[in-house]
């Protein structure tokens, strides 16, 4: 009977570390879900909005080719500055080529001169690889120039014509972008 | 927008006191949380102080703990951060700021956006 017992035990064990794990597996797939969903809705919110306005591109919003780019008048550290971006239905800056850096840092120029700007560039704590928010990995020629010796996480700004890192928890612009909408003509 | 004027800045001995000011105008200044930030030459911008909309809740840099007052007065629209016991390392420019968005939140001053001033040298010499 004891014998019965103790098995029955072992087995109601067994039942709950897989419970455990099947948890611990879903938490981590609805946290990777929030974060997709979070653009989604970036996404969607930006399109619905842009249909009805016939601008490619909100008010204080600056365009170049398919895009828009929003630059910030306030500070943040990095985490709220993507957040403000998410408000406005955009993403922080992600730079695809040698062109588009050219055109922000120029912009930039135009604008408010040498200040440092957040983008969407973060370092991945494990393997120590630069990614930008959708988990593309930059162009070798668009990796920050120094590296941080912060112990903490690890994020990428603007500053002049250069691509630069920091520890995210410092409070800099920041710079949001989105597609610009196409004219229906 | 928010326009935000600082002054009180200036040259002082190591172990002198100085008080800056803030006013703060284009908006409702008592429903917003307000802070003090500082950068020196080459050194990362942090923030020394801040307090909430009521005044019930503060925040002070560890450096300045101690040293350093941050309060308010919301029928003047104005901001102050008393400074005592300076000290060489204070040596930055001092920039008010006020909080993007009225949360209504007492704490958690670091996660919040912030307007900003145009700043005021703050020298302490040994």
């Known amino acids: 009977k004891l014998l019965q017992v103790s098995t029955i035990a072992m087995q109601q064990q067994e039942k709950l570390i897989q419970q455990e794990r099947a948890l611990l597996n879903f938490t981590e797939w609805k946290r990777s879900c929030a974060l997709q969903m979070k653009y989604c809705q970036a996404f969607m919110q930006n399109s619905l909005s842009s249909a009805h306005n016939s601008s490619p591109c909100p008010n204080n919003w600056i365009q170049n080719r398919e895009s828009c780019y929003y630059v910030s008048e306030i500070w943040s550290i990095w985490h709220t500055s993507q957040e403000n971006c998410l408000k406005e239905g955009s993403t922080l800056l992600q730079i695809e080529s040698k062109e588009e850096m050219d055109f922000i840092t120029g912009s930039l120029r135009k604008i408010k001169g040498s200040y440092d700007y957040w983008v969407g560039l973060s370092q991945d704590g494990h393997s120590g690889r630069w990614l930008w928010q959708d988990g593309s990995s930059p162009s070798p020629g668009l990796l920050p120039a120094e590296r941080s010796q912060s112990a903490n996480q690890v994020c990428g700004y603007v500053k002049s014509n250069s691509l630069l890192s920091s520890n995210c928890s410092t409070w800099k612009y920041f710079i949001c972008e989105k597609y610009a909408l196409r004219s229906s003509v | 927008q928010v326009q935000l004027q600082e002054s009180g800045g200036g040259l002082v001995q190591a172990g002198g006191s100085l008080r800056l000011s803030c006013a703060a105008s284009g908006r409702t200044f008592s429903t917003y949380a307000m802070g003090w930030f500082r950068q020196a030459p080459g050194k990362e911008r942090g923030l020394v102080a801040a307090?909430?909309?009521?005044?019930?809740?503060?925040y002070y840099a560890d450096s300045v703990k101690g040293r350093f007052t941050i309060f308010r007065d919301n029928a003047e629209n104005t901001v102050y951060l008393q400074m005592n016991s300076l000290k060489p390392e204070d040596t930055a420019v001092y920039y008010c700021?006020?909080?993007?968005?009225?949360?209504?939140?007492?704490?958690?001053?670091?996660?919040?956006?912030?307007?900003q001033g145009q700043g005021t040298q703050v020298t302490v010499s040994s």
């Open positions: 700021a006020a909080e993007a968005e009225g949360s209504g939140r007492e704490g958690n001053f670091y996660e919040r956006s912030w307007y």
């Open positions: 307090i909430s909309w009521s005044g019930g809740s503060t």
